[in-house]
């Protein structure tokens, strides 16, 4: 049941993450314009990773694609990469989790291909989520260099008396959704990984002896993981004497495909 | 056809306050953000402060704040200047202009004018 | 604040002749966001309120007759009457839209010589 409840955690945990991630990524609030030096702009700007907006005080909003691959910051493409890397893999991550999870059958697929689909999608989200946190502090150490660069000639004198205030950006509403987003489908995936390990029964290289104790016969297998014949397989010990010590797994009992509606 | 009529002049005493309306039509009230200038007699143009129909919004010049006062009345699709304390420099034509939703931030549509004289 | 600064105050041009007027702001009014400069001019005639004439430094409003232009950009601004017409005489403004307070240029009154 434990196993079932971090499994599915796990896996809605990621959805919403790798929902964020996306979300972060199509939004146009990467960057936006700092208002400590100029609070009565008349104008605001801020800007995507795929286009720039201006507002303007009528509530007229104007956007700008980025028309030129070539002409853009390698930085920005970094970012971009890291993020479309991070909802690709989160993507896959989510479809092969869906197959993966315990409370769906499908066919007669054993414990140990869900366990490993788990395991995957597990890495998967962890990877998805490391690649979007790291887009989005690698945009975010971008801004702080621009922010302070522009600090330093905030105002640049044209002929004596004309000032031009150049304009800085600050953090954007999509960098908040983005690190949160990514936090989320980085935990989502580490769920993932835990359920895995209590989804597969471990292979050990002890045999099964047999210990006869007075006038009981009680099959016993040493080991505090789980024994069995075979990696995953859905075969029980059979219980020689009701009243007997209970192996492992007699206490984590496997559901068979008629457990489920 | 969009039109902002402005309520009629007005002669006040120095310290006195008086309130100027401007009704709106032909267009969506609630979409435009209305200012005010103003206009001393033989002077330029000069920017009072804007209220936004649809949320209440205001923003003042500050040279203006703690004096005037700008609000409206959905209902009415009408927008009120109020001024306080008046002096004698505060004589001028009042202006309500709407801004313009794709002009660049400028006024696109002017009320006809509200002449308030201040005199004692 | 934006001070904005016409010149010349007066100016006297024959009809069907080319008028100039200019204005510059103490800051700049070109955006960076979008390279659009937030100036526009207004015509007031007297006993009127003023028109709007030209918006974003050089796009002329609807119904503006194609003898008004504007151009310029960052700080330097300028008014083109390419033919003067009688109707023409008036007063005309530059105004900053793009920081508050708004403000305007003291005004050049164009006159028919």
């Known amino acids: 049941m434990a196993v079932t409840a971090c499994q599915g955690l796990g896996f809605v945990v990621s959805l919403i993450g790798i929902a964020g991630i996306i979300a972060a990524t199509c939004m146009d609030q990467w960057s936006t314009q700092d208002l400590y030096n100029n609070p009565v702009t008349a104008v605001f700007n801020y800007q995507g990773l795929w286009r720039s907006c201006v507002r303007e005080s009528s509530g007229f909003t104007e956007c700008r694609g980025y028309f030129t691959l070539l002409g853009l910051p390698a930085m920005l493409q970094a970012v971009r990469a890291l993020m479309i890397v991070g909802i690709v893999l989160g993507a896959i991550g989510l479809l092969v989790s869906i197959f993966a999870l315990k409370c769906i059958r499908i066919g007669s697929m054993e414990d140990s291909a869900k366990a490993n689909m788990t395991l995957t999608s597990g890495i998967m989200f962890i990877v998805s989520g490391l690649c979007a946190i790291a887009g989005v502090s690698v945009f975010a150490n971008m801004l702080v260099t621009n922010f302070w660069m522009s600090t330093a000639n905030m105002y640049t004198g044209m002929g004596g008396m004309v000032q031009t205030v150049q304009t800085r950006y600050t953090f954007g509403a999509a960098l908040f959704v983005g690190w949160v987003a990514g936090g989320l489908t980085l935990i989502g995936g580490v769920m993932m990984c835990i359920a895995c390990r209590g989804l597969a029964p471990e292979e050990t290289n002890y045999k099964a002896v047999s210990y006869h104790a007075s006038g009981h016969s009680v099959a016993y297998k040493p080991g505090g993981f789980k024994a069995s014949t075979g990696f995953g397989s859905n075969t029980k010990n059979k219980k020689i004497y009701d009243g007997g010590a209970r192996t492992e797994d007699e206490v984590q009992s496997y559901p068979s495909k008629h457990d489920y509606v | 056809e969009v039109q902002l009529v402005q309520s009629g002049a007005e002669v006040k005493k120095p310290g006195a306050s008086v309130k100027v309306s401007c009704k709106a039509s032909?267009?969506?009230?609630?979409?435009?953000?209305m200012h005010w200038v103003r206009q001393a007699p033989g002077q330029g143009l000069e920017w009072i402060g804007y209220?936004?129909?649809?949320?209440?919004?205001?923003k003042y010049n500050e040279k203006f704040k703690g004096r005037v006062t700008l609000t409206r009345d959905k209902s009415t699709s009408t927008v009120y200047m109020e001024l306080s304390s008046l002096r004698s420099e505060d004589t001028a034509v009042y202006y309500c202009?709407?801004?313009?939703?794709?002009?660049?931030?400028?006024?696109?549509?002017w009320g006809q004018g509200t002449l308030v004289t201040v005199s004692s | 604040d934006i001070v904005m600064t016409q010149s010349p105050d007066s100016l006297a041009v024959s009809l069907g002749e080319r008028a100039t007027i200019n204005c510059k702001s103490s800051?700049?009014?070109?955006?960076?966001?979008?390279?659009?400069?937030?100036l526009a001019w207004y015509q007031q005639k007297p006993g009127q309120p003023p028109k709007l004439l030209i918006y974003?430094?050089?796009t002329r409003e609807s119904g503006v007759p194609d003898r008004f232009s504007g151009s310029g950009s960052g700080t330097d601004f300028t008014l083109t009457i390419s033919s003067l017409q009688a109707e023409d005489v008036a007063v005309y403004y530059c105004?900053?839209?793009?920081?508050?307070?708004?403000?305007f240029g003291q005004g050049t009154k164009l006159e028919i010589k």
């Open positions: 202009a709407r801004l313009g939703f794709t002009t660049r931030n400028a006024m696109d549509y």
């Open positions: 032909g267009y969506t009230f609630t979409s435009y953000i």
């Open positions: 209220i936004n129909p649809y949320n209440d919004g205001t």
């Open positions: 800051q700049s009014l070109l955006n960076s966001g979008n390279q659009k400069n937030y």
């Open positions: 974003g430094a050089s």
């Open positions: 105004q900053n839209d793009h920081s508050y307070p708004f403000t």
